[in-house]
């Protein structure tokens, strides 16, 4: 698993990056776990990074990801007093120069090394869900979310609002 120090070195001063022509609103480090409290971990294997969903041993440190928050350039349909309709998007980076990517063809979630500007596949619309959980919807494929399948992350199509509560697309973010 990546050491936290590597990620902390990577944490940048606010506004010094330009992704899709915009800067992040803010960035911070958090650990990512599933609804069932399994940890999302990252490991270097055969010169590529793998993503695992696993139970950690008692004193094992959780991997951290750098969450970068962006406002969408396109508003949602919601309107009314005070709301401007823009949605909150995130990118997730567990180590320098690597970001989670949605591979819509393979229905997979992968870690890709890339330069800025990041491709749209690295952006996810943030959803609030029940039990203080969040979900991550692909910017490139609305209705498709990051989810857990066979102890790996995968892309899961959600075809109705009732299915939005399915446990395998629910995640917890912890800044501690």
């Amino acid at each position: 698993a990546f050491g936290i120090s590597g990620v902390q070195k990577y944490t940048r001063a606010l506004h010094d990056s330009s992704i899709t022509g915009i800067s992040p609103i803010t960035e911070y480090l958090a650990s990512l776990s599933t609804y069932n409290d399994q940890s999302i971990t990252f490991a270097l294997e055969d010169e590529s990074y793998e993503i695992y969903v696993e139970d950690l041993k008692k004193d094992e440190k959780k991997d951290k990801v750098l969450l970068s928050y962006y406002e969408s350039q396109h508003p949602s349909n919601e309107s009314g007093d005070g709301v401007d309709g823009k949605m909150l998007m995130v990118t997730l980076s567990p180590t320098k120069d690597f970001w989670l990517h949605a591979n819509n063809k393979e229905h997979s979630v992968e870690l890709h090394k890339c330069e800025k500007p990041l491709p749209d596949q690295a952006f996810f619309v943030l959803h609030n869900m029940h039990s203080n959980c969040v979900s991550f919807e692909c910017k490139t494929d609305p209705g498709v979310f990051i989810g857990v399948k066979d102890n790996h992350l995968a892309l899961i199509k959600v075809d109705s609002s009732e299915n939005l509560c399915t446990e395998n697309i629910l995640f917890k973010l912890s800044e501690t």
């Epitope: 309709g85 823009k86 943030l126 939005l164 912890s174 800044e175 501690t176």
Partner: nanobody, 119 residues
């Protein structure tokens, strides 16, 4: 829907202090990001401070060490303590929340409160 109401603005001398408040009311109870922005006449709106759901706070370069953002979860209120104010801090200050109960996280703005730093 969500209403954000700012208060605490006014006229203050250079070197003085002000405390801004922003109270959120309405049906939204989960906020992912809370922040303060400001806009001076003829300038773009700029980030002053932003706080995450877990309490991590980042500040704009021009206010670091002088401004402090805090919150009171029980009152759904955020604060901006502004010390050592300078004339260049004169602006309309806006409260900014990102939140939702269920579904995509959306952005909300307050109406703004005027801060004037002048002798």
């Amino acid at each position: 829907q969500l209403q954000l109401v700012e208060s605490g603005g006014g006229l203050v001398q250079p070197g003085g202090s002000l405390r801004l408040s922003c109270a959120a009311s309405g049906s939204i109870f989960r906020f992912n990001l809370m922040g303060w922005y400001r806009q001076a006449p003829g300038k773009q709106r700029e980030l002053v401070a932003v706080m995450s759901e877990g309490g991590t706070t980042n500040y704009g370069d021009s206010v670091k060490g002088r401004f402090t953002m805090s919150r009171d979860n029980a009152k759904n209120t955020v604060y901006l303590q502004m010390n050592s104010l300078k004339s260049e801090d004169t602006a309309v200050y806006y409260c900014n929340f990102w939140g939702s109960n269920s579904g995509p996280v959306l952005q909300y703005w307050g109406q703004g409160t005027q801060v004037t730093v002048s002798s």
